[in-house]
């Protein structure tokens, strides 16, 4: 087998509820309405529901290891390791995938990790001056006649590695996505590797919130003690390709077996069944009521 038969640092447990209660749920969230929808589509990416006053909130309970094994996320951010990336996806309720091992680009100041352990967790690089805020690695050129944000991102040394971005355009390398983001002063994310195709609906690609500006340094390296991550899985061996029809195959360390993490709307051992059930939860002071 390609998978080691032992070793994670996660611990098991049910979805923890507040006030000493335990809610039997896996991926539930809060909607701002009287009837709160709690289903896979409302609290994804490893979130679990927790009672919060009269309602429920989507909690991201991750306790990440702090080994510095940087990965580049599809949002252009570098994360200290895959766990931090997943935690960020959960916190922001946005899909973030690993597009490359290693930092997103070499000039971000977070370094190779040679002799280093922790990510810097630095804030957004912005230059405030008479230019106004320059975002996405842009710098203010105060000497220029038209005074504006100047982009000094050099993508000349990058090899051909086409990606499809959130603006619906194909770029020859992730570096050019950052360059475009810098020039346009707007968030452009990498949607997937490879050129955009006809099936890539630009309305679905979407843009990131302006409140989540591009950060060039290692992300989400915050205090670990706030959450508990229930994790005991790793990628499945290559011979299990196709094991999960509509989902992700995971190798469970403790049981030494493969299992499927199904996409929203699918269920079954191999994510082969369509799941039409949606759980609605009406918050009340006494209990959680299934409608």
């Amino acid at each position: 087998s390609n998978q080691p038969p032992g070793g994670g640092g996660g611990s098991g447990g049910d979805c923890p509820g507040g006030k000493g209660k335990s809610i039997n749920c896996s991926e539930l969230n809060v909607r701002e309405s009287d009837v709160r929808v709690c289903d896979e589509s409302s609290c994804k990416y490893g979130g679990v529901c927790k009672e919060d006053g009269d309602g429920l909130k989507c909690a991201c309970q991750f306790q990440c290891h702090t080994n510095y094994i940087p990965v580049c996320g599809s949002n252009g951010d570098t994360y200290q390791n895959e766990c931090f990336l997943r935690r960020a996806a959960c916190k922001h309720q946005k899909e973030i995938t690993v597009i490359a091992r290693g930092p997103c680009y070499s000039d971000n100041g977070s370094g190779s990790g040679e002799g280093e352990e922790e990510g810097s967790g630095a804030e957004v690089h912005r230059k405030h001056s008479k230019c106004g805020p320059c975002k996405y690695k842009a710098e203010c050129d105060e000497d220029a006649e038209n005074v504006g944000c100047v982009c000094n991102i050099d993508c000349s040394g990058y090899s051909f590695n086409p990606v499809c971005a959130s603006d619906g355009s194909s770029y020859n390398n992730p570096c050019f996505v950052r360059e475009a983001s810098c020039i346009k002063q707007e968030q452009i994310d990498i949607r997937h590797l490879g050129h955009c195709t006809d099936t890539d609906d630009t309305s679905l690609l979407g843009k990131k919130d302006d409140g989540l500006q591009y950060r060039p340094d290692v992300k989400d390296a915050s205090d670990q003690r706030e959450d508990v991550y229930i994790g005991n899985h790793m990628p499945c061996p290559e011979n299990l390709n196709g094991y999960c029809i509509h989902g992700k195959c995971e190798f469970i360390y403790s049981t030494q077996k493969a299992s499927c993490r199904c996409e929203s709307g699918y269920t079954g051992q191999h994510c082969e069944k369509t799941d039409f059930s949606i759980l609605y939860v009406v918050p009340s002071r006494q209990k959680l009521t299934h409608v």
Partner: antibody, heavy 121, light 107 residues
Framework: QVQLVESGGGVVQPGRSLRLSCAAS????????MHWVRQAPGKGLEWVAV????????FYIDSVKGRFIISRDNSKNTLYLQMNSLRAEDTAVYYC??????????????WGQGTLVTVSS | DIQMTQSPSSLSASVGDRVTITCRAS??????LAWYQQKPGKVPKLLIY???TLQSGVPSRFSGSGSGTDFTLTISSLQPEDVATYYC?????????FGQGTKLEIK
Amino acid sequence: QVQLVESGGGVVQPGRSLRLSCAASGFTFTSYGMHWVRQAPGKGLEWVAVVWYEGNSKFYIDSVKGRFIISRDNSKNTLYLQMNSLRAEDTAVYYCARAYCGDDCYPFDYWGQGTLVTVSS
Amino acid sequence: DIQMTQSPSSLSASVGDRVTITCRASQGISNYLAWYQQKPGKVPKLLIYAASTLQSGVPSRFSGSGSGTDFTLTISSLQPEDVATYYCQKYNSAPWTFGQGTKLEIK
């Protein structure tokens, strides 16, 4: 099956260099961080260094920083430890070991048989 | 760096005895702790990971417990083949430090 085979050990004088290799087989090499662990004669285990995945993240124990260089050649499924400015206290059996760290982290499930490095004048 | 301290450094027990080895981390490491067994002249073998999860193929008489800074390896009924040196190791972040080891002998 998974195999890790170290080589390159031997007797070397203080101040000289030695390069250890660890040939890996039976698993997807790029899916694992590769480590060196050493054990001085009659002593306990001492973790030495790690190189993760593509080789862009490395870490060393303080006593070897600046003298040892860990690296990997993923095309050859081989891990290396370049040991420079060797000292008598570097005398030990050197083991390579694999570990998976991604979303979660796991310790050493497979070890090599070890190669003995003796630093002596 | 976080230090790992094992106790005792050596112990002698009889076959059938319940044996306990402790490991203390100088700072909290959650449950990123492993226990290894090394028999004389052999390569270390993983026994326990995630502080309390038994490695595949390891006899059930071995168990682990603890979280944060204090951890325990227990052998419920000592067998002759358990004669070895036992090491704890943290792996939440580099350096992946080992404890100094506990040498277990049969009386």
